[in-house]
């Protein structure tokens, strides 16, 4: 009889443990849902305010045609600049035409004056070819004017009206680029 009672007690305890687990899972699930809800609300608010402002570019970015540009306020080496742009969902500036180059240099003159700005151009160590970050070649008129004598990796930067080259480990400002959002109006 005692054995029977003890077995029932153990079964009850096991049931209780299972219910506690289920409750814990439910609480965790509820917390997760609430958090997801908060994220969704924040995301929706961001989206709605962006839609309301109907700005094709984020705050502090400059628009030209289909592109948005961000001119950094900090210095960094080329690789860190690349990382900083990626964080923003952008890449280092890729200059496609003389018109784009003129817009960039004109804007920089207005904003900051004659400083150095990393762009998404680097020189392949083996072949010596200049390539943009997506692997495409720059058009002939958009090759860095001087060949850097550095034994280290060489990257491209904009200064005044020129595209120049330098050791990628030197510190400069940088320019990020992303696509402008199309207006649905």
């Amino acid at each position: 009889k005692l054995l029977q009672v003890s077995t029932i007690a153990m079964q009850q305890q096991e049931k209780l443990i299972q219910q506690e687990r289920a409750l814990l899972n439910f609480t965790e699930w509820k917390r997760s849902c609430a958090l997801q809800m908060k994220y969704c609300q924040a995301f929706m608010q961001n989206s709605l305010s962006s839609a309301h402002n109907s700005s094709p570019c984020p705050n502090n970015w400059i628009q030209n045609r289909e592109s948005c540009y961000y001119v950094s306020e900090i210095w960094s080496i080329w690789h860190t600049s690349q990382e900083n742009c990626l964080k923003e969902g952008s890449t280092l500036l890729q200059i496609e035409s003389k018109e784009e180059m003129d817009f960039i240099t004109g804007s920089l003159r207005k904003i900051k004056g004659s400083y150095d700005y990393w762009v998404g151009l680097s020189q392949d160590g083996h072949s010596g070819r200049w390539l943009w970050q997506d692997g495409s070649s720059p058009s002939p008129g958009l090759l860095p004017a001087e060949r850097s004598q550095s034994a280290n990796q060489v990257c491209g930067y904009v200064k005044s009206n020129s595209l120049l080259s330098s050791n990628c480990s030197t510190w400069k400002y940088f320019i990020c680029e992303k696509y402008a959002l199309r207006s649905s109006v």
Epitope: Y39, G89, D134
Partner: nanobody
Framework: QVQLQESGGGLVQPGGSLRLSCAAS????????MGWYRQAPGKQRELVAA???????TYADSVKGRFTISRDNAKNTVFLQMDSLKPEDTAVYYC???????????????WGQGTQVTVSS
């Protein structure tokens, strides 16, 4: 939070190909960019390739013309197609997601557990 699950590593001969996959789950709507980094023994982790939420691409000089990054938005998955593999591509490859938390206005990096790629004859 963003969780990342990698697959596709392995042993391959020089000149061979491999395809890495990375599936993202969690706060995927907050992801600004996803990419692949690698770390060879005794070396620093380096960016191999990345793709932004707008589809803009970035490659390391050493892989340009050999590796291709792409994504499947429906499956929240990023792929790295590695062709013409060289012994110097041997490393642990990590998937990375750069995401923005609108609640705390903060940027984060999340990493996968890594997948070994060995190029050897």
């Amino acid at each position: 939070q963003v969780q990342l699950q990698e697959s596709g590593g392995g042993l391959v001969q020089p000149g061979g190909s491999l395809r890495l996959s990375c599936a993202a789950s969690g706060s995927i709507f907050s992801i600004n960019a996803m990419g692949w980094y690698r770390q060879a023994p005794g070396k620093q982790r380096e960016l191999v390739a990345a793709i932004t939420n707008q589809g803009r691409l970035t490659y390391a000089d050493s892989v340009k013309g050999r590796f291709t990054i792409s994504r499947d938005n429906a499956k929240n998955t990023v792929f790295l197609q590695m062709d013409s593999l060289k012994p110097e591509d041997t490393a642990v490859y990590y998937c990375n997601a750069k995401w923005y938390d609108p609640l705390v206005i903060e940027y984060y990096d999340n990493w996968g557990q890594g997948t070994q790629v060995t190029v050897s004859s």
